[in-house]
């Protein structure tokens, strides 16, 4: 289809990019699922100004995004270059903390309270923000 | 009515790939998600992955991430599945069936295909 | 991933008996599940969604309850044409899983 020139209702754009901010919560894998079912992915951060950006639309809330080391080393849901790229880690973090009972580490990572980053057990249900670019979607509406 | 019509049985050597088709008729084939789900002989059903025919966008069981790949064409309403590095494992009737409309109905399945044999085999 | 247990695996039942079946899930899944049936060599029939609505054209014989993590489905008066096997799904998590089935036989 041809390139998409306004984001959808109910999104937010920025940069050339679309975001949605959820305001209920999912495990990684059902939020990363519904980004994709919209045509979307977990949001990539690839900048300063754009942690900035979603930081200030999240709040003081634990919220998904879309960077994970289920495979092994981590990676971003889009192909962005992980090593190279921005990162925003708490001190000591990632950890991959077993501690937890829950079974396994931890392998997708997070916006904590602060904005900056953790590593966190995938099942537990986080917020989480799409992200789509202009550049790449469709003319039609994402399904709602 | 809705019908969905898969292509033929298929016999592959271990390492082969298969490729399955799901011709849809009956309906707006842009309007709904499309899934493949397998079924082993006498076991159970097993999910594959979905694939969004309007725009192309796929998601698929970790177990079958970089070994499936699910495309549409959208002018002959027909969903293709194709499965990589097969193995005796792979041995399965393939389905495709047609899922929700919406993001919230998108794993609700109405309608099946009649099933496809695929045998792995040296 | 969440775990579809269904029971029994298997039952014995004669034409007009009431059967049940049900269908646990690993966590709560709300109304998120549906119920097919498939008989041998063809593909499953959908019958119910959102745990206990019915899909176009089933009899109502059969229907479906439950909410979170159980389930039910049940055939009030099992016809010659009801022995099969049945599954349950979860379509509220990805990914999506189904139960290991009911195969309902002739007494």
């Known amino acids: 289809g041809s390139e998409r020139t306004c984001c959808p209702v109910n999104w937010v754009e920025h940069e050339r990019s679309c975001y949605w901010f959820s305001r209920s919560g999912k495990a990684w894998a059902d939020a990363d699922n519904y980004c994709r079912l919209e045509d979307a992915h977990l949001v990539v951060v690839t900048s300063w100004e754009e942690q900035k950006f979603v930081q200030h639309h999240i709040g003081p809330v634990n919220t998904w995004m879309g960077l994970h080391d289920q495979n092994g080393p981590w990676k971003w849901v889009d192909g962005t270059d992980y090593e190279t790229g921005f990162k925003n880690w708490r001190p000591e973090q990632p950890d991959d903390w077993y501690g937890h009972g829950l079974g396994g580490g931890e392998d997708c990572a997070h916006f904590t309270d602060d904005g900056r980053w953790n590593d966190d057990v995938c099942q537990r249900p986080y917020r989480w923000v799409c992200e789509t670019e202009l550049d790449k979607a469709s003319q039609e509406p994402p399904l709602l | 009515q809705v019908q969905l019509v898969q292509s033929g049985a298929e016999v592959k050597k271990p390492g082969a790939s298969v490729k399955v088709s799901c011709k849809a008729s009956?309906?707006?084939?842009?309007?709904?998600?499309m899934h493949w789900v397998r079924q082993a002989p006498g076991q159970g059903l097993e999910w594959m992955g979905w694939?969004?025919?309007?725009?192309?966008?796929?998601n698929c069981a970790q177990k079958f991430q970089g070994r499936v790949t699910m495309t549409r064409d959208t002018s002959s309403s027909t969903a293709y599945m194709e499965l990589s590095r097969l193995t005796s494992d792979d041995t399965a009737v393939y389905y495709c069936?047609?899922?929700?409309?919406?993001?919230?109905?998108?794993?609700?399945?109405?309608?099946w295909g009649q099933g496809t044999l695929v045998t792995v085999s040296s | 991933d969440i775990q579809m247990t269904q029971s029994p695996s298997s039952l014995a039942a004669s034409v007009g008996d009431r059967v049940t079946i049900t269908c646990r899930a690993s966590?709560?899944?709300?109304?998120?599940l549906a119920w097919f049936q498939q008989k041998p060599g063809k593909a499953p029939k959908s019958l119910i969604y959102a745990a206990s609505s019915l899909q176009s054209g089933v009899p109502s014989r059969f229907s479906g309850s439950g909410s979170g993590t159980d389930f039910t489905l049940t055939i009030s008066s099992l016809q010659p044409e009801d022995f099969a096997t049945y599954y349950c799904q979860q379509c509220d998590s990805f990914p999506l899983t189904f139960g290991g089935g009911t195969k309902v036989e002739i007494k």
């Open positions: 069936a047609r899922g929700g409309a919406t993001v919230t109905t998108w794993g609700v399945f109405d309608y």
């Open positions: 966590q709560d899944i709300s109304n998120y």
């Open positions: 694939i969004k025919p309007k725009s192309g966008g796929t």
């Open positions: 009956g309906y707006t084939f842009t309007g709904y998600f």
